[in-house]
């Protein structure tokens, strides 16, 4: 029987922020409750001279009034004792976009091909997650090779999220567009 308590989930050992830097394309996602990036999601991670990791992300968001906008999001990451677990503060460049604080865990990555990210926003009393989200990232916008897919699939299983992901479309919707010139 799989242990679905968040405290039991393993993350990337000896995570290297510098090697993780650069562009990652979201291939699949498990959504949390509420407003969230829909598709065309691309994230750019960087590390400054002090070693702090930050990220910018772009993706299509459907607002409550059914407007589609390309959102520019920014996140900064605070280190914890575990090098693969961060406290993430995020906000949208436009004022109407979401902002908040989430855990941000790098569950696994080989730095060159794939990455699996996980965040639990709300714990149940039994230690399982009541509201989580997760991304499968690829360095290649076209997808992951079969051998990486099997590793990712295993990680999804270990997060107790195996059948909860949706594929993410990359159709150029947000190329050269942002919420500033859509509204």
């Amino acid at each position: 029987e799989r242990d679905c308590r968040v405290s039991s989930f393993r993350v990337k050992e000896n995570f290297d922020k510098a090697r993780f830097s650069g562009t990652w394309y979201a291939m699949a996602k498990k959504d949390p409750e509420g407003l969230f990036l829909q598709d065309n999601i691309v994230a750019e991670f960087s590390v400054d001279e002090t070693g702090q990791m930050s990220a910018t992300a772009k993706g299509r968001v459907r607002l409550l009034n059914n407007w589609d906008v390309c959102a520019d999001m920014v996140g900064t990451f605070t280190d914890t004792e575990d090098p693969a677990k961060f406290k993430m503060k995020y906000w949208g460049v436009a004022s109407f976009l979401q902002k908040g604080n989430d855990d941000h865990w790098i569950v696994d990555t080989d730095y060159d091909t794939y990455a699996v990210q996980y965040s639990c926003r709300l714990l149940n009393l039994d230690g399982t997650c009541a509201d989580s989200y997760s991304f499968v990232f690829s360095r290649d916008p076209n997808g992951l090779p079969p051998e990486a897919q099997k590793i990712v699939r295993q990680r999804q299983e270990e997060l107790c999220l195996a059948r909860q992901y949706r594929l993410i479309v990359h159709n150029g919707y947000c190329d050269g567009r942002s919420e500033r010139n859509l509204l």
Partner: antibody, heavy 124, light 108 residues
Framework: QVQLQQSGPELVKPGASVKISCKAS????????IHWVKQRPGQGLEWIGW????????EYSEMFKDKATLTADTSSSTAYMQLSSLTSEDSAVYFC?????????????????WGQGTSVTVSA | QIVLTHSPPIMSASLGERVTMTCTAN???????LHWYQQKPGSSPKLWIY???NLASGVPARFSGSGSGTSYSLTITSMEAEDAATYYC?????????FGAGTKLEIK
């Protein structure tokens, strides 16, 4: 709804080539694998290979490496299979089928939608 | 390559009878990557059971699948006329992908 529409039956001469098509609709063509499967009359299913239209990457069964060439045109959401140097052994129905990548987290690579099949008859 | 062997190759069952067919691999297959398809004459195969035990959309609850390692089975609790077909197991565990030769299920 998801559909894979294959081209019509082909009657070809030994030694010739044939190119059959599989037009996809109702889903994001570049995000799923397209497999090709051979079925000779009264026989079972043989996997020929797959193409991932997003990248153009392909993988072939060793048995079909010199026989089949898989391509895809993302602008028309159509996958193609060319069969060369045809012999009577190549007379069969050829199916295209879709499978999601494993990170979709569902179906684990199973072929969830199939085309109706294209009959290829090799005869002088 | 992984060879999948069906047993029996052909079987017949009376309406209402319980039916079990097996698929044996010559090396271990991850149960997540073992699937079954149903095919009727003149039609395309249909995904029937995926990941050993999950019924595909629209498949009646009288069907079930089980197994692990090298031995897998498909069971029908109570045979109905529409179940007459050929059933193929398929592995996505290792390339080349392979299918079994099938079990043809007929009505007695």
């Amino acid at each position: 709804q998801v559909q894979l529409q294959q081209s019509g039956p082909e009657l070809v001469k030994p030694g010739a080539s044939v190119k059959i098509s599989c037009k996809a609709s109702g889903y994001s063509f570049t995000r799923y694998y397209i497999h090709w499967v051979k079925q000779r009359p009264g026989q079972g299913l043989e996997w020929i290979g797959w193409i991932f239209p997003g990248s153009g990457n392909t993988e072939y069964s060793e048995m079909f490496k010199d026989k089949a060439t898989l391509t895809a045109d993302t602008s028309s959401s159509t996958a193609y299979m060319q069969l060369s140097s045809l012999t009577s052994e190549d007379s069969a129905v050829y199916f295209c089928a879709r499978s999601p990548p494993l990170y979709f987290g569902n179906y684990e690579g199973a072929m969830d939608y199939w085309g109706q099949g294209t009959s290829v008859t090799v005869s002088a | 390559q992984i060879v999948l062997t069906h047993s029996p190759p052909i079987m017949s069952a009376s309406l209402g009878e319980r039916v079990t067919m097996t698929c044996t691999a010559n090396s271990s297959v991850n149960s997540s990557y073992l699937h079954w398809y149903q095919q009727k004459p003149g039609s395309s195969p249909k995904l029937w059971i995926y990941s050993t035990s999950n019924l595909a959309s629209g498949v009646p609850a009288r069907f079930s699948g089980s197994g692990s390692g090298t031995s897998y089975s498909l069971t029908i609790t109570s045979m109905e006329a529409e179940d007459a077909a050929t059933y193929y197991c398929h592995q996505y565990h290792r390339s080349p992908l392979t299918f079994g030769a099938g079990t043809k299920l007929e009505i007695k």
